[in-house]
């Protein structure tokens, strides 16, 4: 998982920011994303197809910031000041896993390896940018 580093010049190879078009990821506190995302999807359409697999968890309401957390991986925030996508910080991931993994386990499905919290920054700092839980998401 490649975490964005502060880059005032913006890396020459970085794709431009694009408007968030995935319905689940609208109105969560940011409006721009960048592809490919942190899971390797090359378009928002691809990301949306996989993200929809989590709709049952979102509907269960097992974690208040689950939608924001998932979107931070599938449609990560983009800013022109940073050359790579900015994911959620590890504590948000760990809270989501703690509260939502038991729901998946009821159906004999484990927490996905792709959402491994250990790969996320522990906290937001200039060398490993990540997003804290939003106030009103």
């Amino acid at each position: 998982l490649e975490i964005g580093r502060f880059d005032p010049e913006r890396g020459r190879g970085a794709a431009p920011c694009q408007a968030v078009e995935i319905p689940m990821c609208r109105g969560i506190g940011y409006n721009l994303t960048r592809m490919p995302n942190l899971l390797g999807h090359t378009s928002q359409g691809e990301a949306a197809a996989e993200l929809a697999e989590f709709a049952p968890l979102v509907q269960y309401g097992c974690h208040s910031h689950l939608r924001f957390f998932l979107c931070s991986l599938y449609a990560p925030m983009c800013t022109d000041q940073v050359s790579t996508p900015i994911p959620a910080c590890r504590p948000m991931c760990e809270q989501a896993r703690l509260r939502c993994a038991p729901i998946m386990e009821q159906f004999n499905f484990g927490w996905p390896d792709s959402l491994d919290c250990a790969r996320l920054p522990t906290r937001n700092d200039p060398h490993a940018l990540c997003m804290e839980a939003p106030e009103n998401a």
Partner: antibody, heavy 124, light 107 residues
């Protein structure tokens, strides 16, 4: 033409293994979540397994969990089902099936393109 | 696991007549229900998704309705090519289930 072409079925003894393949043509497989569905002779349809478009999310019916493994190679536009520890009750026609293309960001829980099916017979 | 029960098991209808097939879910599936047609020796074909939306290329004589636990597939005027087995299917959480099927045969 948009289609799924299957291969790999056949006769296998109980406890044996078999790998089914499903090659996509006319569309880019990496855009779609994919499924395997089976149909025992003279019976109805049974969902078997599902894999997300990147391959990072996989799901199985309880009847095959721990024995079957779904995978995909998007660079080859191909879906696979590895079947181990096969039992007589696994005898069926196996179909690969694509998630419905909603032409947008809303997904519908239906399968719009199906392979032609491949027969798997488990017998001694 | 949500169970889908289709009725009747067999429906005998004359060409040109109306056919009404029922699918009942053991608990609510909202509108997340699809209908398929299957002919002998062939793969299933998607007819209806999201309870009432016709799939691409499906004739207007096929229509779906219902929500929650009660769903209906209606074929307004049966053609010879419509005699087949029809399945309903739903997805709940991460599990898919199909109904046992309704065979529509020539009367």
């Amino acid at each position: 033409e948009v289609q799924l072409v299957q291969s790999g079925g056949g006769l296998v003894q109980p406890g044996g293994s078999l790998r089914l393949s499903c090659a996509a043509s006319g569309f880019n497989l990496r855009r779609y979540n994919m499924n395997w569905v089976r149909q025992a002779p003279g019976k109805g349809l049974e969902w078997v397994s599902r894999i997300s478009n990147s391959g990072s999310l996989v799901y199985y019916a309880d009847s095959v969990k721990g024995r079957f493994t779904i995978s995909r190679d998007n660079s080859k536009n191909t879906l696979y089902l590895q079947m181990n520890s096969l039992r007589a009750e696994d005898t069926a026609v196996y179909y690969c099936a694509r998630d419905a293309d909603s032409s947008g960001y809303y997904r519908y829980d239906a399968f719009d393109i199906w392979g032609q099916g491949t027969m798997v017979t488990v017998s001694s | 696991e949500i169970v889908l029960t289709q009725s009747p098991a067999t429906l005998s209808v004359s060409p040109g007549e109306r056919a009404t097939l029922s699918c009942r879910a053991s608990q609510s599936v909202s509108s997340n229900l699809a209908w398929y047609q299957q002919k002998p020796g062939q793969a299933p074909r998607l007819l209806i998704y999201d309870a009432s939306n016709r799939a691409t290329g499906i004739p207007a004589r096929f229509s779906g309705s219902g929500s929650g636990t009660e769903f209906t597939l209606t074929i307004s005027s049966l053609q010879s090519e419509d005699f087949a087995v029809y399945y309903c299917q739903q997805r709940n959480n991460w599990l898919y289930t199909f109904g046992q099927g309704t065979k529509v045969e020539i009367k």
